[in-house]
Amino acid sequence: LRLLDFPAPVCAQEGLSCRVKNSTCLDDSWIHPRNLTPSSPKDLQIQLHFAHTQQGDLFPVAHIEWTLQTDASILYLEGAELSVLQLNTNERLCVRFEFLSKLRHHHRRWRFTFSHFVVDPDQEYEVTVHHLPKPIPDGDPNHQSKNFLVPDCEHARMKVTTPCMSSGSLWDPNITVETLEAHQLRVSFTLWNESTHYQILLTSFPHMENHSCFEHMHHIPAPRPEEFHQRSNVTLTLRNLKGCCRHQVQIQPFFSSCLNDCLRHSATVSCPEMPDTPEPIPDYMPLWEPRSGSSDYKDDDDKGSSHHHHHH
């Protein structure tokens, strides 16, 4: 979690002098409670926006917006603490709006926005706006919280952000998979414009089940420059198991910008409409773990064989 470095955030508006300050997420009013405290924010909304840094990079940001309730407690409102909590890591980042003048009621409802929290693709957050000072220990809460889910890099707007492009979001392999005779699959995909190797991960499943009955990994060496953007064709030999008929093919690239952590693309071949009654399939534990670069796979001969060529 971090704050956008540019432009400087602004909280001042007509009728209010205000400055944005970094916060430790522990406002002084927690330690020294006040007798009179403001009511909670109203209509807190969190939206996905996009912003450029000074260097021209594009990042997803959480656009936070809320309004004030129209009660007399705004006379005691000294500011607001904005907090973003990343749910999985428990990492929290806060900023404080410090009001330098007293709020007064006027003809329109007071509205505040902040769009400087940079968020990560495919992450989950809880956003909280606390009005300051915070209430006494047994007082009514004067904060509002909302959850916020940032889409992954397959989302159209996310695709062109700097973090997504760094993980290979612009590569569209356009995978095709066809079933051949003699228990074979032909996989075809478009190579990217980088001299880097790829891995094809094949996982097969019985009809209507989610536990694999066959797995195979195939390495594709780095293409030469004249092969960039060309189709690569690979023929994979399947294990002859009746009922092991649904095949998921995943292609993992190893681009220089993301190494072992690049976005993967997959395609699935469904079982034929009327599958045979499946034979008992032995328990089979997955031996590879996506997101890691190394593999515990045995030699190709152990799991089936494959060959490939680049198609110009």
């Epitope: 969190i46 749910l87 428990n90 889910l149 996506p290």
Partner: antibody
Framework: QVQLVQSGAEVKKPGASVKVSCKAS????????ISWVRQAPGQGLEWMGW????????KYAQKFQGRVTMTTDTSTSTAYMELRSLRSDDTAVYYC?????????WGQGTLVTVSS | EIVMTQSPATLSVSPGERATLSCRAS??????LAWYQQKPGQAPRLLIY???TRATGIPARFSDNGSGTEFTLTISSLQSEDFAVYFC?????????FGGGTKVEIK
């Protein structure tokens, strides 16, 4: 391929405890939270809470507060959900699922039957 | 807590036809809505999140419309594998809550 594999069915007496396991493979357990959801026979889905394997942080539904404990063992990529003081209306299929908001991969479910 | 209400409880549709499922939240949840599909004896499967983003591998015939309190899941042309129970779920605030489900059955 992301997979969550849960422990087998359990039959328990009222007042007993049950501990359901959920083994994750195909991704690193600490990269995402694990949520637990249950489904009584023929009924809808009920959220129980979540745990972050990365931080150990938990959030439980108020209904289960004090009766449920969620833990993880990162060395075995396994999450656990223990429910204590079981009652007959705790009879349900208990699911683990990846993530904390929109749950993208689910275990196959563990049927817990509470009967005297 | 936010109450999610789905309608109808059962929807009878012929294969190839369009199915429209409704989900209503008791208060505004912005776009913080997910849809799941569940077949008998199986775990739910995530279809859509953020009220409109399809999960990985979900066909384009599934789409959602709505934000705030009213949401609609549309299956443009029902395939045989689409007959199942569909649940909506809000993740706007804790606790997460699910709708009661809509069963889509063959007419």
């Amino acid at each position: 391929q992301v997979q969550l594999v849960q422990s087998g069915a359990e039959v328990k007496k009222p007042g007993a405890s049950v501990k359901v396991s959920c083994k994750a493979s195909g991704y690193t357990l600490t990269s995402y939270g694990i949520s637990w959801v249950r489904q009584a026979p023929g009924q809808g889905l009920e959220w129980m809470g979540w745990i972050s394997a990365y931080s150990g942080n938990t959030k439980y539904a108020q209904k289960f507060q004090g009766r449920v404990t969620m833990t993880t063992d990162t060395s075995t990529s396994t999450a656990y959900m223990e429910l204590r003081s079981l009652r007959s209306d705790d009879t349900a299929v208990y699911y683990c699922a990846r993530r904390q908001l929109a749950l993208d991969y689910w275990g196959q479910g563990t049927l817990v039957t509470v009967s005297s | 807590e936010i109450v999610m209400t789905q309608s109808p409880a059962t929807l009878s549709v012929s294969p190839g036809e369009r199915a429209t499922l409704s989900c209503r939240a008791s208060q505004s949840i912005s776009s913080n809505l997910a849809w799941y599909q569940q077949k008998p004896g199986q775990a739910p499967r995530l279809l859509i999140y953020g009220a409109s983003t399809r999960a990985t591998g979900i066909p384009a015939r599934f789409s959602d419309n709505g934000s705030g309190t009213e949401f609609t899941l549309t299956i443009s042309s029902l395939q045989s594998e689409d007959f199942a129970v569909y649940f909506c779920q809000q993740y706007d605030t804790w606790p997460l809550t699910f709708g009661g489900g809509t069963k889509v059955e063959i007419k």
